[in-house]
Amino acid sequence: NSYYDKVLAHSRIRGRDQGPNVCALQQILGTKKKYFSSCKNWYQGAICGKKTTVLYECCPGYMRMEGMKGCPAVMPIDHVYGTLGIVGATTTQHYSDVSKLREEIEGKGSYTYFAPSNEAWENLDSDIRRGLENNVNVELLNALHSHMVNKRMLTKDLKHGMVIPSMYNNLGLFINHYPNGVVTVNCARVIHGNQIATNGVVHVIDRVLTQIGTSIQDFLEAEDDLSSFRAAAITSDLLESLGRDGHFTLFAPTNEAFEKLPRGVLERIMGDKVASEALMKYHILNTLQCSEAITGGAVFETMEGNTIEIGCEGDSISINGIKMVNKKDIVTKNGVIHLIDEVLIPDSAKQVIELAGKQQTTFTDLVAQLGLASSLKPDGEYTLLAPVNNAFSDDTLSMDQRLLKLILQNHILKVKVGLSDLYNGQILETIGGKQLRVFVYRTAICIENSCMVRGSKQGRNGAIHIFREIIQPAEKSLHDKLRQDKRFSIFLSLLEAADLKDLLTQPGDWTLFAPTNDAFKGMTSEERELLIGDKNALQNIILYHLTPGVYIGKGFEPGVTNILKTTQGSKIYLKGVNETLLVNELKSKESDIMTTNGVIHVVDKLLYPADIPVGNDQLLELLNKLIKYIQIKFVRGSTFKEIPMTVYRPAMTKIQIEGDPDFRLIKEGETVTEVIHGEPVIKKYTKIIDGVPVEITEKQTREERIITGPEIKYTRISTGGGETGETLQKFLQKEVSKVTKFIEGGDGHLFEDEEIKRLLQGDTPAKKIPANKRVQGPRRRSREGRSQ
């Protein structure tokens, strides 16, 4: 079934309560415009944003019978001429009579007659109508023939994009059959279709078709009020393409529209081939979009590549939400033109600062006021990380101008980075020389402490991304941050007693759930000694508060639990609810305190892994005193496992390479950084080691494990061949520095640095790290492998 037929069927369903063959139509209030009711329009009770009233009429082809409900009788079938009377197109019938067309359409043959309604004739320009009436034998006859096709075509045969030769000089009739059920012929809407006749079919249309002989190019060349657009089309080498065959829709801005543009904007765009071509193409659709087919907002791709939203408000057409079409449906032989009174500027023709919307005006105003706008050169490439207006507090705005400028510089990058270019672990450099980290989560992208909101755009000289908060690059390490805040003095002392201070000082990516002194309320000095006395217990407890990877609270999908594996090995459960982070269902007191090697979320309770039993009565008593949110298991004699600290030290490896090995890049897989289950995935690939191809079987174990590779630092490299030490060093640092694979050569383990060294020298691996231990160096996180 065609779209028209589907909508008609829907109208029939909506009208069946009124009796057989009754269709529900919706009439736009204050107009005579009626539409068969689509599902969407029915429920909205509106078309083009205007309220509608429901009318119940006989479905096409049926009629009422006196004293009976609905439309139980079928309309009589007659020849085309008689059918014009049946459908009420009496003016067309009269003109067919006086123009001597009557004999033709009463006789033999098969015709499709697109018959203008009586109202359509009334709306026709009076001079044109008079001209037809003054020359009925030629002009009127030709005009009517141009509404006819030499075969019967029902709406199901009227396919979108079809061009049917009319009976006048084979002039084309452009058929459009839209998904909303609207069928148009040269942009005239079929308001009553498929009235079958003995020798054809009649479709009533809402306007008289005027003869089409010109292309869009011809129209532009003839229309003085489009001279600006014409000149711009010539400049962009687009005018001739608008003379070619096609089904284009052109939104042509008038000269007045160009006058509305700030002169500077126009001068810049017209001086930039790429921008001016983008500007022109943004006004052209590769599909024919008649105004009558627009019954609600719809998005269309332009020739430029970006989309525009075409909507309607009553009789007016809006583009991107603004009423701007002042003349509709100028039909040409290769498309339709709508005259608009504003120039549409695509993002691709805008300067990066012009991409900002109403919600980022504080940022753009400050950028201009503090002299940063002038540093955004039109031929440069930048990225603006624009916080929304309410991110700027009064305190921030009243800051010293120099400080404010430094803050703003943290929001401008030296390069153009589009949304699709961002990846987890990426480091971005600002124009102020600061480095910002990118964190990619399941439903969020964050830079440092601030996460993006929708609305990223790419312009001519850069991109813009919108952020919830002002971005604050971290200055201090986790350890320094804890040390400068008195709230964490107890936790810090325990951390140091457990020999874990270095862990929070060295580079890395961690999430620390830092308990405040309140978490230890009531702990006596004896109890503290008890805790410190069992180093394994202390390490297990502290490392349960530390998770590899940076997890920003605002990056969490709201209301969804995220299961992370802590450094201690047990799981921790995080959830974002109403701007608050829940850690094991405990409310975080403060979150997203950024540091150079991670993020801190503040908790006022001590956290404990529910799966780890305690075997010491005194320790259990202490933990029960401090931890109320879970019931800690007691298993007499149970001890805490040792967590080998060597695992968390970054390794320094010396590699001496003799000779000139043949290095070839083999693309490594992603690091697994998510809690995953399932069968191992085994892949075979060949790696070139010391010039020799070696077949390696890779087993990606899908257990609950987080795997990351140690980072190797090369301190001395000597070569005995053509390659310079420097190039080879660069190559090694780039390509071999992160080993993030399970390689089967026993039971699926990570190589240690020594093994890598031996591999590079051609030996086979010997020493292995047990599979239940984690290797931790400064980490590379995978993009997909995040649980957020």
Partner: antibody, heavy 118, light 110 residues
């Protein structure tokens, strides 16, 4: 064909005002703007401002803001430029030019010499 | 004083190519398009090149324009005696919000 015909030469005293007219023909007057450009004797060109013949919107050069007024009369397809508080350095040939914006100053009037002398 | 800098004169013999240069800043030529005007002795200026390199209809293809960074140039090939005139470059200046002209270059055909 497109033509812009300007009013004749004027001699004015310092402090006075001058109003130069520019009658357009050969095109739809309201479809284009008009810019005014002046040229002091033996000197280069200086843009004074622009007016939309359709809306009457104007854009004046900062230097002349407050002293210059540009107007149009669509019924006669004529543009006017009035300069007040004349000084001797306002002595110049004043040109009107059709300004389509996309194609700037594509047709020029013949020029009107305004001499400011005491 | 003009915002755009042009060499005061240039000359060539018939048939030669003469290049007129125009130098500006990031706020004018650097950001916007350049247009060129020809002013024959005792006449009004005439648009020669617009949008850096576009010729209006009726302008011979001996005239060509180009722009790079903050400077632009006009090349006149196959120089003719009728080309003897003053040539002005012009561009919009974002910082002044004004249309600015160059000082003009007098081209002489030897």
């Amino acid at each position: 064909q497109v033509q812009l015909v300007q009013s004749g030469a004027e001699v004015k005293k310092p402090g006075a005002s001058v109003k130069v007219s520019c009658k357009a023909s050969g095109y739809t007057f309201t479809s284009y703007g008009i810019s005014w450009v002046r040229q002091a004797p033996g000197q280069g060109l200086e843009w004074m401002g622009w007016i939309s013949a359709y809306t009457g919107n104007t854009n004046y050069a900062q230097k002349l803001q407050g002293r210059v007024t540009m107007t149009t009369d669509t019924s006669t397809s004529t543009a006017y430029m009035e300069l007040r508080s004349l000084r001797s350095d306002d002595t110049a040939v004043y040109y009107c030019a059709r300004d389509m914006l996309v194609v700037p100053f594509d047709y020029w009037g013949q020029g009107t010499l305004v001499t400011v002398s005491s | 004083q003009s915002v755009l800098t042009q060499s005061s004169s240039a000359s060539g013999t018939p048939g030669q190519t003469v290049t007129v240069s125009c130098s500006g800043s990031s706020s004018d030529i650097g950001s916007n398009r350049v247009n060129w005007y020809q002013q024959l002795p005792g006449t009004a200026p005439k648009l020669l090149i617009y949008s850096n390199d576009q010729r209006p209809s009726g302008v011979p293809d001996r005239f060509s324009g180009s722009k790079s960074g903050t400077s632009a140039s006009l090349a006149i090939s196959g120089l003719q005696s009728a080309d003897e005139a003053d040539y002005y470059c012009a561009a919009w200046d974002d910082s002044l919000s004004t249309y600015v002209f160059g000082s003009g270059t007098k081209v002489t055909v030897l």
